[in-house]
Interface confidence: low
């Protein structure tokens, strides 16, 4: 194969791979017809002048996971056909000016996971055809104006996992073709207005795991093609009324792990493609009417682990396609009977770990497709007659860890539970809290006459088959999808991003996996 170095393997497809700790310099002679060269996991510490001079047909060069700390400016001379160059996972602290000069065909440049302290406009001024630039996992503290001005064709730029404390509003102004911009895991405290104005083709913007406290009102005003916006794990305490008003293509928005205290109506401006909205781990205390009314296609809404104590009756107006609603671990004491009335397609509702004392009889009146209801760990003493009777698809109902009052009034519920025991699961069953003489006994098998001996209680066979709710209109039957979406924590959908880990101690939270939002 035109002379393959002994420490490398060469394939008929002109691919050369050189690996191993014994390699301390670029092996020679390399096959002149090599089109792909990989130098991986070696002890090479530097690249000298023109080590690749004789392989001018090279298209892809990967020099990764080495001890590389020094490169001379002419190291890549004569590689005019090179399209892909990776120097990732080395120990580079500085890049010589002119290092990429002559790489006129270069489209992908990977410099991630090094120790780069700075970049300068001159570093990339020759790379006019570059489409992808990976700089994540370095020690960059600042990006100077002009650093990317010559990269007008760039479509993907990753600056995540650096030490950036601020961004100039002009640094991205010439990147009109950029589709993906990642700034996650930096130390950004605010983003200047206008920073993203030039990014008219941007589809993904990753700003999660920074220290952003405030979003400028028109920050995303010009990014009409944005599809994925990651703002989770920041310090955002409020959302300007118009901040999301110009994002009609958005289909993924993460805001979990911030300090949001309130959501104003209309804050989520028309987003016809948004399917999931993650708002857990904030400080939201109430939900006003119509707060989500523009999100007509929303299927998953996660509001768990907030401080919600009040939900206005019209808070969920417009969410006709919602399948999953997570409200667990909040401070809810009561709910309006109409609060879920618009959620005709709801399949799964998590209300565990609240302070609910009672539920209105019509609370689930129009939600005929409900398959799972989590009510454990509340303050419920009883439930209204017939509350679940119309829920023909209900297959999971969690009622344990409530202070059930096992007097004569509990009989209808007990009898319904007897007939529907499989729906309660086998892990934990609801037990009586009062009266004291039956405390701790299973609600399902308790003899109410023993619990309250002085009261004669007629046996009630079950809840009525067709419940009548005096103050409630009758709702038409709705068809609902029978499969439930698994609610796991949102994983940002690209590989070079650290996944958010959600604490999943089900014994503490009382959650099934489907509710661990």
């Amino acid at each position: 194969y035109h002379g393959c170095p002994s420490e490398c393997t060469c394939s008929r497809a002109s691919q050369v791979e050189c690996t191993g700790a014994r390699i301390v310099a670029v092996p020679t002679p390399l096959p002149w017809n090599a089109m792909s060269l990989q130098i991986l996991n070696t002890h090479i510490t530097e690249l000298n002048e023109s080590p690749f001079l004789n392989i001018s047909a090279l298209i892809a060069l990967r020099i990764e996971k080495n001890e590389l700390s020094r490169i001379t400016p002419g190291a890549f001379r004569n590689l005019g056909s090179l399209r892909y160059l990776s120097l990732a996972n080395n120990k580079l602290q500085v890049l010589p000016i002119g290092l990429f000069q002559g790489l006129d065909s270069l489209e992908s440049l990977l410099l991630s996971s090094n120790q780069l302290l700075q970049i300068q406009p001159a570093h990339f001024s020759q790379c006019s055809n570059l489409k992808e630039l990976q700089l994540h996992g370095n020690h960059l503290e600042y990006i100077p104006d002009g650093a990317f001005d010559h990269l007008v064709g760039l479509t993907k730029l990753n600056l995540g996992k650096n030490s950036l404390t601020h961004i100039s509003p002009r640094v991205f102004q010439h990147l009109g073709n950029l589709q993906v911009l990642r700034l996650y895991e930096n130390r950004l405290t605010d983003i200047p207005m206008g920073t993203f104005d030039g990014l008219v083709n941007l589809q993904e913007l990753a700003l999660q795991q920074n220290q952003i406290g405030l979003l400028s009102p028109g920050l995303f005003h010009n990014n009409h093609n944005l599809q994925r916006l990651y703002l989770s794990n920041n310090h955002i305490s409020q959302l300007p009324p118009s901040v999301f008003m110009q994002l009609p293509q958005l289909n993924r928005l993460t805001l979990f792990g911030n300090s949001l205290k309130e959501l104003s109506p209309g804050i989520f401006g028309p987003m016809p493609n948004l399917r999931e909205l993650w708002l857990y781990d904030n400080h939201i205390s109430s939900l006003p009417d119509n707060v989500f009314s523009n999100l007509r296609q929303l299927q998953v809404l996660i509001l768990s682990r907030n401080q919600i104590s009040f939900i206005s009756p019209g808070a969920f107006n417009g969410l006709t396609e919602l399948r999953e609603l997570s409200l667990h671990t909040n401070a809810l004491q009561d709910l309006d009977g109409n609060v879920f009335r618009m959620l005709a397609n709801l399949q799964n509702i998590s209300l565990q770990n609240n302070r609910l004392r009672q539920l209105p009889g019509n609370i689930f009146a129009n939600v005929n497709g409900l398959m799972a209801i989590q009510l454990q760990n509340n303050q419920l003493e009883n439930l209204p007659l017939g509350i679940f009777d119309h829920l023909g698809k209900l297959c999971e109902l969690r009622l344990y860890d409530n202070p059930w009052r096992c007097d004569s009034d509990i009989l209808p519920l007990r009898n319904w539970l007897l007939l529907n025991q499989p729906r309660l699961g086998t892990d934990t069953v609801p037990v009586c809290f009062s009266p004291a003489n039956v405390r701790g006994q299973s609600l399902i098998i308790i003899n109410v006459n023993v619990a309250v001996p002085s009261v004669h209680v007629p046996e009630v066979p079950s809840y009525p088959e067709t419940p009548w709710y005096p103050d409630t209109p009758s709702y038409p039957d709705t068809t609902s999808v029978s499969s439930t979406t698994e609610l796991t924590s949102p994983v940002e959908d690209y590989t070079d991003l650290t996944t958010i880990q959600v604490t999943d101690d089900r014994s503490v939270w009382g959650m099934t996996q489907a509710q661990s939002g």
């Epitope: 206008g194 104005d197 009102p217 010009n222 009409h224 110009q246 028309p270």
Partner: antibody, heavy 116, light 107 residues
């Protein structure tokens, strides 16, 4: 009450630069965007571009090479400069408040004629 | 850029008539559409935004509807003071663009 008032010369020579200023009263220029729109005779309305108090701008691509819009927050003003004008740039020029799209307050408009 | 096409270009109707103007976008713009009224020699005035939301102070005889590519402005009962040119405007995608206008006159 929000008011906008355009000012600047009504006559500009061909190839010269058209300069207009819009003074905003009754509202802070530090909120929303601020746009210029023009109406040529019989041609309908054409958006020229907007500016934000930070200096961020967005221009109509058809005019981008000739236009610049700037803001002076201390004076609550924003300005339009259009280079290399021709007779086709003769129009009534309006400034307007851009509430992230819709224009809810407009200036009275100023007619600019390009003629030698 | 998004092109907005209004129809008709002009119309004449009697006082009290129901008048309808349509605006078609060259691509879907959700409900990011506004309507303006411009009386002769006057400044354009915002009537409706978000396709159907009436701007404060605008008479209730004006209404808007539509989403995606097809939009409608309706005047339920035409009044003499409604003589004007009406424009639709896209604010879904920059550059903001206007329709060519519909001139409304009284018979």
């Amino acid at each position: 009450q929000v008011q906008l008032q355009e000012s600047g010369p009504g006559l500009v020579k061909p190839s010269e630069t058209l300069s207009l200023t819009c003074t905003v009263s009754g509202a802070s220029i530090n909120i929303y965007y601020w746009s210029w729109i023009r109406e040529a005779s019989g041609k309908g309305l054409e958006w020229i571009g907007y500016v934000h108090h930070s200096g961020g701008t967005n221009y109509n691509p058809s005019l981008k090479s000739r236009v610049s819009i700037s803001v002076d927050t201390s004076k609550n003003q924003f300005s339009l400069r259009l280079k290399s004008v021709t007779a086709a740039d003769t129009a009534v020029y309006y400034c307007a408040r851009d509430t992230y799209g819709p224009f809810d307050y407009w200036g009275q408009g100023t007619l600019v004629t390009v003629s030698s | 850029e998004i092109v907005l096409t209004q129809s008709p270009s002009s119309l004449s109707a009697s006082v009290g008539d129901r008048v309808t103007i349509t605006c078609r976008a060259s691509q879907g713009i959700s409900n990011y559409l506004a309507w303006y009224q411009q009386k002769p020699g006057k400044v354009p005035k915002l009537l409706i935004y978000a396709a159907s939301t009436l701007q404060s102070g605008v008479p209730s005889r004006f209404s808007g509807s539509g989403s995606g590519t097809d939009f409608t402005l309706t005047v339920s009962s035409l009044q003499p003071e409604d003589v004007a040119t009406y424009y639709c405007q896209n604010y879904y995608s920059a550059p903001w663009t206007f329709g060519q206008g519909t001139k409304v006159e009284i018979k």
